[in-house]
């Protein structure tokens, strides 16, 4: 008899989840020299212990302690790069810029970058047909709690100037909803962050307005000014040439404004 | 490129012991699980032993468990199988593989050796 199975409105677990997990583990400890005292069977054993036999809407950071404990990660403060919906430009940017770091490049958000997860209560399987959504299900879910116990933990680590990365192509270039708006700007610690630095990614050639001035970025601002972290920001006219003018810094085309 | 060579392996006596070992080249021994695996004459591939990629786990097969220990020197990129109590059941060829881990049911295995032929008879 087929046993009852709740239906949750999200995609479920990323399809061999365990292995992906596992080899993502072993592929960061070869290129991460500094990371080779990680056994990554204590930490796959720790990732399927936050959330196997428990109800997905019941997870809390308390659950993900023992695999934070065993992802504990130096890496240098003053070059941290936060984002908010645009992933993958940052990511471009510290392939390129190595001495900077994104949450994903370190080990723990390596791990489990793109990926969906969720068990069941009392059971010891993962459940690969469908996961709770954030809204439509709830917030205490395996994935969601993951990453705002990971990215609370890598803002208060945060030193000197932090940079974020923002998109100007959006509505909300500033979304007070996002992991960085809700999670980050609030556990930046101003006793060791100077300044919070934005950088607003426009998103059309001719686009040649100050997103700075956004009312969004404003709202930053204040929200930063009442921490006591300086603020400031840049526009990134040509997301394209920055990048390249990273790789190229010689360039005579990159003394311009990017 | 990835080379795992087995030896060790012998002529033994039921109740006797045995020492294989491993030596791996051309990857990054200390990132990877390792396990043994072995193919008795006439069946199939069966699982005999993992070790984590810094020895901290350790996992056996019930039929060897108590009798069978896995060790590793990443400091030298080697790894043991020590064989007590042999049974007439352990003859097989006995070959290293290297992998990412253990989920619980499944063993992740990349690469895997020649094998050493282990033979347990009187």
């Known amino acids: 008899v087929p046993r009852w199975r709740q239906q949750w409105s999200g995609p479920g677990t990323t399809k061999r989840f365990p292995e992906t997990v596992l080899a993502r583990c072993v592929k960061y400890t070869e290129i991460h020299p500094e990371m080779r005292h990680v056994d990554c069977q204590s930490v796959w054993d720790a990732f399927k212990g936050a959330f196997i036999s428990k109800h997905p809407c019941n997870i809390t950071e308390e659950d993900y302690q023992p695999l934070m404990k065993l992802g504990t990660q130096t890496v240098p403060c003053n070059k941290i790069l936060l984002w908010s919906r645009i992933k993958d430009l940052a990511h471009q940017f510290t392939q390129v810029q190595r001495d900077m770091f994104t949450l994903e490049d370190t080990l723990l958000g390596y791990l489990a970058d793109d990926l969906t997860w969720c068990g069941e209560f009392n059971t010891s399987k993962i459940n690969y047909q469908s996961c709770p959504d954030w809204r439509k299900d709830c917030s205490n879910n395996p994935v969601s709690v993951f990453w705002k116990t990971v990215s609370r933990r890598f803002a208060e680590a945060a030193c000197d100037v932090v940079h974020v990365m923002l998109n100007g192509s959006r509505s909300k270039i500033f979304d007070k909803n996002s992991t960085f708006g809700s999670v980050e700007v609030h556990n930046l610690q101003p006793e060791k962050v100077q300044t919070l630095e934005a950088w607003v990614i426009h998103g059309g050639r001719e686009d040649s307005r100050d997103l700075c001035q956004d009312p969004t970025i404003k709202e930053l601002e204040s929200i930063i000014s009442k921490r006591n972290i300086q603020f400031s920001c840049k526009n990134i006219y040509r997301p394209d040439k920055f990048l390249q003018c990273v790789k190229n810094p010689e360039d005579s085309s990159c003394t311009s404004e990017i | 490129e990835v080379q795992l060579l087995e030896s060790g392996g012998g002529l033994v006596q039921p109740g006797g012991s045995l020492r294989l070992s491993c030596a791996a080249s051309?990857?990054?021994?200390?990132?990877?699980?390792m396990s043994w695996v072995r193919q008795a004459p006439g069946k199939g591939l069966e699982w005999v032993s993992g070790i984590s990629n810094r020895g901290v786990n350790t996992y056996y097969a019930d039929n060897v468990k108590g009798r069978f220990i896995i060790s590793r020197d990443n400091s030298k990129n080697t790894l043991d199988l020590q064989m007590n109590s042999l049974r007439a059941d352990d003859t097989a060829v006995y070959y290293c593989a290297s992998g990412k881990g253990w989920d619980g049911n499944t063993w992740y295995e990349d690469y895997r050796g020649q094998g050493t032929l282990v033979t347990v008879s009187s």
């Open positions: 051309g990857f990054t021994f200390s990132s990877y699980a």
